[in-house]
């Protein structure tokens, strides 16, 4: 038996930040679980991890180069990614493992979310501004 994961197909990070919500066909309340976010088509780079159990506060881990926070819902984990760079535009996959209570469960691979990080285009100040008006 596998957990199903739903993600938005695409998100645009206009201000270098994005909320990626991973929705599961499973209630995480009073469970020990490890939710993770993976970058790239081959899911090679794990960038963020949320660990939760029934007796402790949620623990969030961010890989170097990523600024990540996590929020838990009954059937979801939302990853809040900040300070994203344009070159971090990629497809991101949510994964979930539930360890306790048995049986161990993990998810069917999701379709992923393309996160498009838009660069900040600041208007350059003119080199030779005209005379200021009184």
């Amino acid at each position: 038996n596998k957990i199903l994961v739903k993600q938005s197909p695409m998100l645009v990070a206009y201000d270098n930040a994005v909320n990626l919500s991973c929705k599961y066909s499973y209630n995480l309340f009073s469970r020990e679980f490890r939710a993770s976010l993976h970058k790239g088509l081959d899911s090679a780079v794990e960038v963020c991890v949320v660990y939760g159990n029934y007796s402790q506060q949620l623990q969030v881990y961010s890989k170097t180069g990523f600024n990540c926070d996590g929020k838990l819902g009954n059937e979801s984990v939302t990853f809040y990614l900040q300070n994203l760079y344009v070159n971090q535009t990629d497809i991101y996959f949510c994964k979930i493992e539930v360890m306790y209570p048995p049986p161990y469960l993990d998810n069917e691979k999701s379709n992923g979310t393309i996160i498009h990080v838009k660069g900040k285009h600041l208007c350059p100040s003119p080199l030779f501004p005209g005379p200021s008006k009184p």
């Epitope: 020990e32 490890r34 993770s36 794990e46 991890v49 660990y51 623990q59 881990y61 890989k63 170097t64 493992e97 360890m99 306790y100 993990d106």
Partner: nanobody, 124 residues
């Protein structure tokens, strides 16, 4: 809950070698990292080396690069630290740590569980 048991510490002469082991037991996820930290008397616990589950990501403190090698046997849930060319300044209690992060983290705060420590003494 994860339990960690270290072994392999002892006394060795400068230039000598030791291999530390750390066996993890308890509920394991498919991805986690383990690392070694050390604490000399009167000093903070400092990062030595770490390795992820897939063994494709390892990190070392500058002071041990080229002398120490971290490895792991996933079938045994065990991580090893091969230490060679040991120096007096390597004398410390070596602690094994476990983190739910899936990368070789050097951040002490990322580690959730610790072993009891094993003493390494380097002296002539």
């Amino acid at each position: 809950e994860v339990q960690l048991v270290e072994s392999g510490g002892g006394e060795v002469q400068p230039g000598g070698s030791l291999r530390l082991s750390c066996a993890a037991s308890g509920r394991m996820f498919s991805n986690y990292a383990m690392g070694w930290f050390r604490q000399a008397p009167g000093k903070e616990r400092e990062f030595v080396a770490a390795i992820n589950y897939r063994r494709d990501d390892a990190d070392y403190a500058e002071s041990v690069k080229g002398r120490f090698t971290i490895s792991r046997d996933n079938a045994k849930n065990t991580v090893y630290l091969q230490m060679s060319s040991l120096r007096a300044e390597d004398t410390a209690v070596y602690y094994c740590g476990f983190t739910y992060a899936g990368w070789a983290s050097s951040g002490r705060d990322d580690y959730n569980y610790w072993g009891q420590g094993t003493l390494v003494t380097v002296k002539p």
